[in-house]
């Protein structure tokens, strides 16, 4: 069954945590649907963003952070492992120095920590996708 | 009650027709939600687009056409009559030489016809909005 989109969930992250998302683009890649995943510092959507991950399907991925309300230097990738019309599984793992983003089991993007992952309080998944799975796994201490 | 998004409806347009849309952005303007309205030449989403109207709420509006699968010259406006968090009423009227876009009763954008409005067979409304009304009114002959 489908999860509501935008989908918002409280989350605490640290090294070893993984966020897993399963979904499907709502439009063909010709129409450039988007997927966005934002790791927020508060439960409010207007809060700062520790890790912003935005896919323009078929075109590019941009990653960034929003600090004190201001977007910082954008990191762009043309790597496009997503398939037109196909379901995707996205996993974002918190490594000691960066986020590692896997798409369908394949390491596809990395983003160096700018803000501590411990500052994350909420994850939001939104834009032009249907969402079937959202999970945050925590490292067993 | 809410209409599904993306929302797709068969439509025939000509001078005097008006498309009316009521909705609300799904996110605060800081997060740059989008609204998109596309007038397609076929019932298929990958068909050409006679009039493409895309709002990046709080930032800008772009208008364009997609002909033989290729985007043409984009028209951009910084005019932003939409209000953060507020419901909007959008009406797109087919004039003899152009589309006139009204936002909350105020004339806000125009786009000269590139392809005959009679070529339109479907209207799609999508991206980051909730949709409460969609109506196509036809000129009484």
């Amino acid at each position: 069954s489908l999860l509501p989109v935008p989908y918002t969930e409280a989350a605490s992250l640290s090294t070893g945590s993984t966020v897993t998302i399963k979904g499907r683009p709502l439009a063909c890649f010709l129409n450039e649907p988007y997927l966005q995943v934002d790791f927020h510092t508060e439960m409010k959507e207007e809060s700062d963003i520790v890790f912003h991950f935005q896919v323009c399907f078929g075109r590019r991925v941009v990653m960034n952070s929003r600090e004190y309300g201001a977007w910082k230097q954008q990191v762009e990738s043309k790597n496009m492992p997503f398939q037109d019309g196909q379901e995707f599984e996205l996993s974002i793992s918190v490594l000691p120095d960066k986020y590692q983003v896997m798409v369908n089991g394949q390491s596809s993007y990395t983003f160096d920590h700018r803000i501590k992952p411990e500052a994350v309080k909420m994850v939001q998944v939104w834009r032009d996708i249907s969402l079937t799975k959202f999970n945050v796994s925590y490292l067993k201490r | 009650s809410l209409l599904p998004v993306p929302y797709t409806e068969a439509a025939s347009l000509s001078t005097g027709s008006t498309v009316t849309i009521k909705g609300r952005p799904l996110a605060c303007f800081l997060n740059e939600p989008y609204l998109q309205v596309d007038f397609h030449t076929e019932m298929k989403e990958e068909s050409d687009i006679v009039f493409h109207f895309q709002v990046c709420f709080g930032r800008r509006v772009v208008m364009n056409s997609r002909e033989y699968g290729a985007w043409k010259q984009q028209v951009e406006s910084k005019n932003m009559p939409f209000q953060d968090g507020q419901e909007f009423e959008l009406s797109i009227s087919v004039l003899p030489d152009k589309y006139q876009v009204m936002v909350n009763g105020q004339s806000s954008y125009t786009f000269d016809h590139r392809i005959k409005p009679e070529a339109v067979k479907m209207v799609q409304v999508w991206r980051d909005i909730s949709l409460t009304k969609f109506n196509v009114s036809y000129l009484k002959r």
Epitope: A70, Q73, H113, R114, K116, A119 | -
Partner: antibody, heavy 118, light 107 residues
Framework: QVQLVESGGGLVQPGGSLRVSCAAS????????MSWVRQAPGKGLEWVSA????????YYADSVKGRFTISRDNAKNTLYLQMNSLKSEDTAVYYC???????????WGQGTQVTVSS | SSALTQPSAISVSLGQTARITCQGG??????VSWYQQKPGQAPVQVIY???NRPSGIPERFSGSSSGGTATLTISGAQAEDEADYYC??????????FGGGTHLTVL
């Protein structure tokens, strides 16, 4: 073994220009952000400028913005700092630094002295 | 003046524990790292990412941060630890800032 060797320092008059260089070896230079940090005589450390691995993004301290330009040549494993409109307060030892993964300054060169005086 | 405040000098008896503080940063957001500088030498990183020790740095060096204060702890200070110590954090992720430095004297 990371090695960073600065060169090009010297004496320059106020308003003048100077370009300092940093030759890097012992690591994959093109994979790292690089920075310049300076230290005025008897004072503390001051971050001056940074550049991303590809060279497309540059960052500057307010004190040097508009006067200094950081650049890199990944083919030559070399980092540069072009200093224009120099002031006496720019007098310092300038260190070339390899940035670590968490935006920290992992390896430092021995520094090159820049003196701005008439 | 630096946005990060450190005591200008502290002293510690040989073998005792020295704690150098760094205040005024948003350490809930941004990592802190620490640098040791001996006279006439380039700085050396002793802690990065709040509490991580680079290889080659003795185990007696440790770091922590909480709220608006970061602390470098030297447990069992040695004579060779006498040096200036600087904290580094961020006003924003693209604007690093150093503390003013602390001179550690080992008695």
């Amino acid at each position: 073994q990371v090695q960073l060797v600065e060169s090009g320092g010297g004496l320059v008059q106020p308003g003048g220009s100077l370009r300092v260089s940093c030759a890097a070896s012992g690591f994959t230079f093109s994979s790292y952000y690089m920075s310049w940090v300076r230290q005025a005589p008897g004072k503390g450390l001051e971050w001056v400028s940074a550049i991303n691995s590809g060279g497309g993004s540059t960052y500057y301290a307010d004190s040097v913005k508009g006067r200094f330009t950081i650049s890199r040549d990944n083919a030559k494993n070399t980092l540069y700092l072009q200093m224009n409109s120099l002031k006496s307060e720019d007098t310092a030892v300038y260190y070339c630094v390899q940035n670590g993964g968490i935006w920290s300054f992992g390896s430092w060169g021995q520094g090159t002295q820049v003196t701005v005086s008439s | 003046s630096s946005a990060l405040t450190q005591p200008s000098a502290i002293s510690v008896s040989l073998g005792q524990t020295a704690r150098i503080t760094c205040q005024g940063g948003n350490f809930g957001y941004y990592y802190v790292s620490w640098y040791q500088q001996k006279p006439g030498q380039a700085p050396v990183q002793v802690i990065y990412g709040d509490s991580n020790r680079p290889s080659g740095i003795p185990e007696r060096f440790s770091g922590s941060s909480s709220g608006g204060t970061a602390t470098l702890t030297i447990s069992g200070a040695q004579a060779e630890d006498e040096a200036d110590y600087y904290c580094l954090s961020y006003e924003s992720s693209d604007y690093p800032v150093f503390g003013g430095g602390t001179h550690l004297t080992v008695l």
